[in-house]
């Protein structure tokens, strides 16, 4: 096909393919009517001036996972409808200026994973076409201003996996068309107020794993269109009160794995799109009434591994569509009554590793849907009668590592145990703790004459005497909640994020992967 | 008759990690929790977590990070495995059980201890 | 985390004497619903592991003699030896459970 390299293979549709070791330069005579060349896993460890003059066609050109260290300037010279161009996973350290001049097509210049110690404003200067800009995985401290001036139509800048410690607050001004902005896994400790002014179109900012400690209060303020905020991983220790009050698009907002003491009531401002809130890994302490009221679509809130010692009756107000609420491992040691109240379509729950000495008998009163209730891994003795009587669709109930308490009292949980151990899962079944004659004994078989009666000694009621069998022999995978494969964090929705562990880990918040979204 | 014996104890260089074991007998792990507790020479008791019947576990925050505790029942054996060595780390080490108490965190039985060094 | 903190340090008491060793908490012990103080004591003589004494703050362990006493509410606790013995010479430490457990720092008491 006009001339195919012998180390290339070229195909009808005009793309090239160049690969291997034994390749040091770029191979020659390419054909002149190649519209995508692709040089990958090469030895090449430079480009010389031109080596790409005769294939002025060229839309888009792939030079990755290189020994590539220099650029001659005028390397892309001819080029000029060369829309996409990536240079990523070679060993770049400096750009010569005017490496870019004369790409007036260009759209996308992929540039990540290099070793660039820094950019300059006349580095981009004549990349007026611009739509996506990769820097993500390099050596960057700091951002000159004026760097990103002239590319006034930049949707798309990953500045992520950098060493960037501060940003200056016009760095983005001239970006009004941006709309994903990431500045992932750098060491920022602040951002300025009016940092983010500018970019009025922006629908992801990704500020995860930086060392923020504080938010200005107006930070968000100008980006109305803001729909994926990723804030976690960071050393944020309070929230100003109106910090989040202009996110009306917000649909996803990760908060994990700060240093968070406490949440205001109303913090989090109106967001009616937000489905997903977590917030697990902070030092809440307590939650008070109406923290949440704002996030009426809100299906998915996870709080574990705080130290939540107290929730407010009234902490859980407005979540009437919340699914799935994970508290476990806290510092719980009572709920009130009602505090569940107002989670009609709750399905999941996990209290589990927590305090918690007794449960109010009408704690999940108004809860009917409830498919799954972590318990286990707390203090508690008995429960109340009927607690779970009318919880029909009850599938997965985890009472194990209690210290039950199995003198008479413990009857009536005894014979609905009994009559219901599908539910219980058959791998770790409650035990009893006292009296110490009959500690560790299955709760469910354990002969209760033998225990030592208690004071009060109560007629014995029943929960509900039918037995209960699911329809199904597992609980269906997409709303599973059986703690095999969890995801230590959310999948934060990139296509160039390199890394999104999965890990069997047990501990994050008590529901499994499919249930991360 | 109850026993707890601890070993795996040594010395160990600053940066590694160890593994005690805990070999229980007259009672069964899958009916009683186990508890860890370390000693440093001269020094005051500190809880450093448990492992319940169910395979529960909480840890020490301090520690969380450093530690991690599990369990074969068939081989009515506990373990604490501790990453990231310190000097500070040198103590004498202890796992306990709750078998008599109506104090579910109480400890009751003790065993012998095993004793850790750190240093280079 | 609740911090535990004993005094005194140490106690030198004469045979057949009270010794009285305090305990204070950072925040309340006191579960308002199962009206339970979760603190106990522990005994530790030399060379020994350590021997569950009193829990619930007032409830002495089978077998412990009579002579040890526990008391106290919230975040005040007390263990009383009413007639030191020879044999009782050894660190004293209290317990929470309130929440994970945490240890005092100890008190030694020995014969004056």
């Known amino acids: 096909y006009h001339g195919c390299p012998s180390e290339c293979t070229c195909s009808r549709a005009s793309q090239v393919e160049c690969t291997g070791a034994r390749i040091v330069a770029v191979p020659t005579p390419l054909p002149w009517n190649a519209m995508s060349l692709q040089i990958l896993n090469t030895h090449i460890t430079e480009l010389n001036e031109s080596p790409f003059l005769n294939i002025s066609a060229l839309i888009a050109l792939r030079i990755e996972k290189n020994e590539l260290s220099r650029i001659t300037p005028g390397a892309f010279r001819n080029l000029g409808s060369l829309r996409y161009l990536s240079l990523a996973n070679n060993k770049l350290q400096v750009l010569p200026i005017g490496l870019f001049q004369g790409l007036d097509s260009l759209e996308s210049l992929l540039l990540s994973s290099n070793q660039l110690l820094q950019i300059q404003p006349a580095h981009f200067s004549q990349c007026s076409n611009l739509k996506e800009l990769q820097l993500h995985g390099n050596h960057l401290e700091y951002i000159p201003d004026g760097a990103f001036d002239h590319l006034v139509g930049l949707t798309k800048l990953n500045l992520g996996k950098n060493s960037l410690t501060h940003i200056s607050p016009r760095v983005f001004q001239h970006l009004g068309n941006l709309q994903v902005l990431r500045l992932y896994e750098n060491r920022l400790t602040d951002i300025p107020m009016g940092t983010f002014d500018g970019l009025v179109n922006l629908q992801e900012l990704a500020l995860q794993q930086n060392q923020i400690g504080l938010l200005s209060p107006g930070l968000f303020h100008n980006n109305h269109n803001l729909q994926r905020l990723y804030l976690s991983n960071n050393h944020i220790s309070q929230l100003p009160p109106s910090v989040f009050m202009q996110l009306p698009q917000l649909n996803r907002l990760t908060l994990f794995g700060n240093s968070l003491k406490e949440l205001s009531p109303g913090i989090f401002g109106p967001m009616p799109n937000l489905r997903e809130l977590w917030l697990y890994d902070n030092h809440i302490s307590s939650l008070p009434d109406n923290v949440f009221s704002n996030l009426r679509q809100l299906q998915v809130l996870i709080l574990s591994r705080n130290q939540i010692s107290f929730i407010s009756p009234g902490a859980f107000n407005g979540l009437t569509e919340l699914r799935e609420l994970s508290l476990h491992t806290n510092a719980l040691q009572d709920l009130d009554g009602n505090v569940f109240r107002m989670l009609a379509n709750l399905q999941n729950i996990s209290l589990q590793n927590n305090r918690l000495r007794q449960l109010p008998g009408n704690i999940f009163a108004n809860v009917n849907g409830l498919m799954a209730i972590q318990l286990q891994n707390n203090q508690l003795e008995n429960l109340p009668l009927g607690i779970f009587d009318h919880l029909g669709k009850l599938c997965e109930l985890r009472l194990y590592d209690n210290p039950w308490r199995c003198d008479s009292d413990i009857l009536p949980l005894r014979n609905w145990l009994l009559l219901n151990q599908p539910r219980l899962g058959t791998d770790t079944v409650p035990v009893c703790f006292s009296p110490a004659n009959v500690r560790g004994q299955s709760l469910i078989i354990i002969n209760v004459n033998v225990a030592v009666p208690s004071v009060h000694v109560p007629e014995v009621p029943s929960y509900p005497e039918t037995p209960w069998y699911p329809d199904t022999p597992s609980y269906p995978d997409t709303t599973s909640v059986s703690s095999t494969t969890e995801l230590t964090s959310p999948v934060e929705d990139y296509t160039d994020l390199t890394t999104i562990q999965v890990t069997d880990d047990r501990s994050v918040w008590g529901m499994t992967q499919a249930q991360s979204g | 008759e109850v026993q707890l014996v601890e070993s795996g104890g040594g010395l160990v260089q600053p940066g590694g990690s160890l593994r005690l074991s805990c070999a229980v007998s007259g009672f069964s792990l899958t009916s009683y929790g186990v508890h860890w507790v370390r000693q440093a020479t001269g020094k005051g008791l500190e809880w450093l977590g448990h492992i319940w019947a169910g395979g529960s576990t909480n840890y020490n925050s301090a520690l969380m990070s450093r530690l991690t505790i599990s369990k074969e029942n068939a081989k009515s054996s506990v373990y604490l495995q501790m990453n990231s060595l310190r000097a500070g780390d040198t103590a004498m080490y202890y796992c306990a059980t709750h078998m008599i108490t109506e104090d579910y965190y109480g400890m009751d039985y003790w065993g012998q201890g095993t004793t850790v060094t750190v240093s280079s | 985390d609740i911090v535990m903190t004993q005094s005194p340090d140490s106690l030198a008491v004469s045979l057949g004497e009270r010794a009285t060793i305090n305990c204070k908490s950072s925040q309340s012990l006191l579960n308002s619903r199962t009206r339970k103080n979760y603190l106990a004591w522990y005994q530790q003589k030399p060379g020994q592991s350590p021997k569950l004494l009193i829990y619930?703050?007032?409830t002495r362990e089978s077998g412990v003699p009579d002579r040890f006493s526990g008391s106290g509410s919230g975040t005040d606790f007390t263990l009383t030896i009413s007639s030191l013995q020879a044999e009782d010479v050894a660190v004293y430490y209290c317990?929470?459970?309130?929440?994970?457990?945490?240890f005092g720092g100890g008190t030694k008491v020995e014969i004056k």
């Open positions: 317990k929470q459970s309130y929440n994970l457990p945490t």
């Open positions: 619930w703050a007032s």
